[in-house]
Amino acid sequence: QSPPGKPEIHKCRSPDKETFTCWWNPGSDGGLPTNYSLTYSKEGEKNTYECPDYKTSGPNSCFFSKQYTSIWKIYIITVNATNEMGSSTSDPLYVDVTYIVEPEPPRNLTLEVKQLKDKKTYLWVKWLPPTITDVKTGWFTMEYEIRLKSEEADEWEIHFTGHQTQFKVFDLYPGQKYLVQTRCKPDHGYWSRWGQEKSIEIPNDFTLKD
């Protein structure tokens, strides 16, 4: 039996700049029941506070609701582990909510096979920004990637589309079924997870419909 090992703050992420969650990895428990507490202060302020909500985001996490989230402040966050034999504290993590945004994936992915005047076939991929994103006001600007692969292929083909919410994919094989996903990233943040997979079959004898 021994004091607990040093915990490590794994990451902090915000879906929308309005709330955020931090997760930690506990160290060894020293063979004893161990309690974990997350404390934080804001740069330039004296007070230290305890995590407002240990439940919402699951085990080894702390959820900061709107009430506890400020975007123009740097949070200094530590996790403390305590058991009967002693305690240990993580290295502090400095968090600026503006820089930890990981949004929801784009929504309303639609796939349509189309044809140019020269009979060249392409797949027209369109989507919408994630629901919480207020793109128009500049609160968020999102960049996007799409990925696709034929059902038989092992590797995804990735296309960066910038701020555009549509993309035309050329040189596809007729008769093949393609899987497509999209993801997005705000200016200073992280890529979302890949969104829901959609599939479409490229017809063998595609003819333009009026």
């Epitope: 999102m142 990637e145 960066f160 910038g162 701020h163 993309f167 035309k168």
Partner: antibody
Framework: EVQLQQSGPELVKPGASVKISCKAS????????IHWVKQSHGKSLEWIGY????????GYNQKFKSKATLTVDNSSSTAYMEVRSLTSEDSAVYYC?????????????WGQGTSVTVSS | DIQMTQSPASLSASVGETVTITCRAS??????LAWYQQKQGKPPQLLVY???TLAEGVPSRFSGGGSGTQFSLKINSLQPEDFGSYYC?????????FGSGTKLEIK
């Protein structure tokens, strides 16, 4: 015919700012990205950033993030780049270019360039 | 950032000859490569995008090839108007970067 017409040459003092314009014609302005590229005398090309007029989305080369600001005025189909805190290192020809309508990063039409000279 | 290494830095050739310029990306950029031609005092002009697609109005003596990290631009039967500087540029994801250029001169 697609055209990008840039503003004239600038001679500016160190520490000052300059705002270059790029007026687009011959296509739907909001459908295409506008890129900005720097070319120092006798050197290669450096991508500064781009703006998508449809939603004012921007992407910057980190090197220029605190140096340049990209904006658009959709009513006049004009893109602008402001370069601030100028030093001799900023003396260069600056180009605006239209991004291909599908592939974001290749630039199919270019402005004639705006020469910026920083000198006291 | 993805680095683009272009070679040679300069080359001399005669009208009618065939020349090849190469470009190497520091990581996989699939087929996201463009080639530009630039004449003295003028803006660059797009020649090729997506590694091998000729831009509108570009003569068929120009051809692009390669994918992944190795790319080339081939000019068959050089014409007097082909002399100038050539740049490769990846357009895979931001930041987009250019090669250092190849100056093609008349021998």
């Amino acid at each position: 015919e697609v055209q990008l017409q840039q503003s004239g040459p600038e001679l500016v003092k160190p520490g000052a700012s300059v705002k270059i314009s790029c007026k687009a014609s011959g296509y739907t302005f909001t459908d295409y990205n506008i890129h900005w590229v720097k070319q120092s005398h006798g050197k290669s090309l450096e991508w500064i950033g781009y703006i998508y007029p449809n939603n004012d989305g921007t992407g910057y080369n980190q090197k220029f993030k605190s140096k340049a600001t990209l904006t658009v005025d959709n009513s006049s189909s004009t893109a602008y780049m402001e370069v601030r805190s100028l030093t001799s290192e900023d003396s260069a020809v600056y180009y605006c270019a239209r991004g291909d309508g599908n592939y974001v990063g290749d630039m199919d039409y270019w402005g004639q360039g705006t020469s910026v000279t920083v000198s006291s | 950032d993805i680095q683009m290494t272009q070679s040679p830095a300069s080359l001399s050739a005669s009208v009618g000859e065939t020349v090849t310029i190469t470009c190497r990306a520091s990581e996989n950029i699939y087929s996201y490569l463009a080639w530009y031609q630039q004449k003295q005092g003028k803006p660059p002009q797009l020649l090729v995008y997506n590694a091998k697609t000729l831009a509108e109005g570009v003569p068929s003596r120009f051809s692009g090839g390669g994918s992944g990290t190795q790319f080339s631009l081939k000019i068959n039967s050089l014409q007097p108007e082909d002399f100038g500087s050539y740049y490769c540029q990846h357009h895979y994801a931001t930041p987009f970067t250019f090669g250092s250029g190849t100056k093609l001169e008349i021998k």
